[in-house]
């Protein structure tokens, strides 16, 4: 105890009344209102308690503090007096803080600041919305992957900031009337190759696709090496003459002059050079049947070897070549007798005539085109007299029950053996190359040498052998009647045909004669 | 009847270019390669190069390569020849011609004489 | 590239006479063509395809030949006949001419 009579022992936060006694400080209490123990304690009071009688008022907050309290105004309030902290609600100034004003970037990009009472709230403008994770933060919808599916499906959505636009897709526009970008925007495929808008390589034919185009070799071209076909940048070469070459193992200075004529035509064609090159071709082999120099020396086989050669690579090449031909019928004929008779056409329905001096040729014109072929229907003839000196003694091969027929009314072949070609040898071909099974007969007319009496008469075609050489057959091809000098032929196939005369013994009452073979 | 008509003469100094034109008529001017020619005085024929106005396709002689341009317009039926860097030795009538493998070169144009003089 | 050479480079004859001129290609050609120059005038194609002559051209001209050898013949001169002959190939890049071969009178 002091000399005052003030007690030394006064728990913290007290101060002692006398000798023995001590009592809380303001703002704290203890079990007794009067401590006569050093064992007891001063607890601050919580003047901010429900049950307390401070009261604040609006807008602000009550807080706690070491023997005391403070009223302070509540977030997003402010005291219009200034002072930071009061004591009771008659002292209380607080006010709503207007946000928005104080700092106009409070909603950043994309929201507009609206104030509330002690807050604010960012709104979005159309086409954002809130951040879940911060409320504050606005945004971007993409429209193009919320379900909405806000474009027509002929365009494709993109999206931008805060909006979309319906955009044509790649090879489209917008139908007429129509805009490109809006909601309502309707598109429809750009026909690129009818306007201009694509980029095919000369050698080759643009064809429109769904949103697109292809660029796709012109008949008669490949694309070149490494390149493939029906592309944007598909680049072609001709190959109407790369592949019409001498035959193997055959040694003929006239013929590899043919061939090298061939070759210059092909080395700088060009598609508006096709009729130019169709009659050099055809003089060339005009010129080279007419005077076939070492040909004629080479063994039979081989003369029949090159004929088949000639025949068969004749047919592609100016298969190749027509289908560059503007619309109209051709006629050419050359010195020794060659002919080649011609007719493009866009697609008719209707039959086709070939008339040449020596052959007439009919046929329906739709066989002419393979469906889904861009190019041109073509149908042509070549009568070529010369190629029967390359085809001297070339054998008949008929088939067993033709043979048998044969046999069995006639006395059979007589010694000397191979048929006599009675007409000049014929080349018939059309654009389409799938001619092996045509679904309506062609026929055709030959005029020729007056035939033997008592001997056979049979429209025939070559047939290249696997060999590379070839014979003469008549599978798929009927005589439909003969006279002393003409004879007509129906086919189911086209190839190069003729007449021949068969050294049979016919008896001129024996009713075979009447027999189509 | 088949026609080319060239343009008229020209007198040029070495360095600066030339061009020249061949107006074609009386024929499809895409069935054939226009061919151009030259002839220095008192010297042989010389060829420079051909153009297909089908596509623009060229072809040129090794020595003219990179100095001549042959080019056609179809629209015209028109087909040109520039020739940059002209040198005295340039000095020549140029003649086009239309031509094909097989037949030559079946019509001429009358010439245009270019001298290059300093 | 294909060299042509003509020969003789200068032929003398007299009208009436016979004359033959060479042109010999240095590779194979298959189409050999001949044009008929006169002074101040564009040349004319006189012989195409080796032998096939041209629309106008009289037949007393030939022409004749194959791979590397070729030969062009006047079968009786006349005295418009005589002028610069050229011979020329495009059977490979770049076409060529020949030097020519000049018909003088004698």
């Known amino acids: 105890q002091d000399s005052r009579g003030c007690a030394r022992w006064c728990p913290q936060d007290s101060s002692c009344v006398n000798a023995t006694a001590c009592r809380c400080n303001p703002g704290f209490s203890s079990f007794s209102e009067i401590i006569t123990t050093p064992m007891e304690t001063c607890d601050d009071i919580n003047e901010c308690a429900t049950l307390s009688k401070v009261s604040c008022g609006k807008f602000s907050d009550c807080w706690n503090t070491e023997g005391s309290y403070d009223c302070v105004c509540s977030p997003g309030y402010e005291p219009v007096s200034g002072a930071k902290t009061f004591k009771n609600e008659s002292e209380n100034t607080c006010q709503d803080v207007d946000e928005c004003q104080q700092n106009p970037r409070l909603c950043k990009s994309y929201g507009t600041c609206v104030n509330t009472l002690g807050s604010y709230t960012c709104q979005c403008l159309p086409g954002f919305k809130l951040k879940p994770e911060d409320p504050k933060l606005c945004t971007d919808v993409n429209e193009c992957t919320s379900g909405q599916n806000p474009c027509h499906s002929s365009t494709h959505c993109l999206n931008n900031v805060g909006s979309y636009q319906c955009r044509c897709r790649p090879g489209w526009q917008p139908i007429p009337g129509s805009p490109n970008g809006p909601n309502n925007t309707v598109c429809e495929d750009v026909d690129e190759c009818s306007s201009g808008q694509h980029q095919c390589d000369s050698s080759t034919v643009c064809f429109n696709t769904v949103g697109s185009y292809s660029c796709r070799c012109r008949p008669g071209w490949k694309p070149r090496h490494g390149i493939p076909n029906n592309q944007k940048d598909t680049v072609c070469e001709d190959m109407t003459f790369s592949t019409w070459t001498p035959p193997p193992g055959v040694h003929s200075q006239t013929l590899s002059r043919f061939f090298d004529k061939v070759q210059d035509l092909g080395r700088d064609y060009k598609p508006g050079l096709a009729n130019n090159t169709i009659q050099s071709i055809l003089q060339a082999l005009d010129e080279l049947l007419e005077a076939p120099g070492d040909l004629e020396t080479l063994p039979r086989l081989q003369q029949h070897c090159v004929a088949s050669h000639l025949l068969d690579g004749l047919e592609d090449v100016l298969r190749g070549l027509s289908k560059n031909l503007s619309n109209g019928l051709l006629n050419f004929s050359y010195p020794a007798g060659t002919e080649l008779s011609l007719e493009v056409q866009k697609q008719v329905d209707r039959s086709v005539t070939l008339r040449q001096n020596q052959a007439v040729m009919q046929l329906d014109w739709n066989q002419a085109q393979k469906s889904g072929d861009p190019g041109p229907s073509v149908v042509g003839l070549v009568s070529i007299p010369g190629m029967g000196k390359l085809l001297a003694e070339a054998p008949l091969v008929l088939e067993p029950e033709k043979q048998m027929l044969l046999h069995e009314t006639h006395q059979g072949l007589l010694q000397d053996g191979s048929p006599i070609l009675l007409s000049d040898v014929i080349s018939a071909f059309l654009s389409n190359n799938d001619t092996q099974n045509l679904s309506s007969p062609v026929t055709f007319t030959f005029s020729h040498r007056s035939v033997i009496p008592r001997q056979k008469v049979l429209c025939v075609f070559w047939e290249h052998g696997q060999n590379g050489c070839g014979h003469w057959a008549t599978t798929g091809c009927s005589t439909i009647g003969t006279r002393d000098t003409s004879t007509i032929c129906r086919c189911t196939h086209l190839s190069s045909f003729a007449v021949l005369m068969a050294h049979y013994d016919v008896q001129e009452e024996d009713p075979v004669l009447t027999v189509i073979t | 009847q088949v026609q080319l008509q060239q343009s008229g003469a020209e007198v040029k100094k070495p360095g600066a270019s030339v061009k020249l034109s061949c107006k074609a008529s009386?024929?499809?001017?895409?069935?054939?390669?226009m061919q151009w020619i030259r002839q220095a005085p008192g010297q042989g024929l010389e060829w420079i190069g051909a153009v297909y106005p089908g596509d623009g396709d060229t072809r040129y002689t090794q020595k003219f390569q990179g100095r001549a341009t042959l080019t056609a317009d179809t629209s015209t039926s028109t087909a040109y020849m520039e020739v940059s860097s002209l040198r005295s030795e340039d000095t020549a009538v140029y003649y086009c011609?239309?031509?094909?493998?097989?037949?030559?070169?079946?019509?001429w144009g009358q010439g245009t004489t270019v001298t290059v003089s300093s | 590239e294909i060299v042509l050479t003509q020969s003789p480079a200068t032929l003398s004859a007299s009208p009436g006479e016979r004359v033959t001129m060479s042109c010999s290609a240095s590779?194979?050609?298959?189409?050999m063509h001949w044009y008929q120059q006169k002074p101040g005038l564009a040349p004319r194609r006189w012989i195409y395809?080796?032998?096939k002559l041209a629309s106008g051209v009289p037949d007393r001209f030939s022409g004749s030949g194959s791979g590397t050898d070729y030969t062009f013949t006047i079968s009786r001169m006349e005295p418009e006949d005589f002028a610069t002959y050229y011979c020329q190939q495009w059977s490979s890049n770049p076409l060529t001419f020949g030097g020519g071969t000049k018909l003088e009178i004698k």
């Open positions: 011609a239309r031509g094909f493998t097989a037949y030559g070169m079946d019509y």
């Open positions: 395809d080796t032998s």
């Open positions: 590779s194979s050609v298959s189409y």
């Open positions: 009386g024929y499809t001017f895409t069935n054939y390669w």
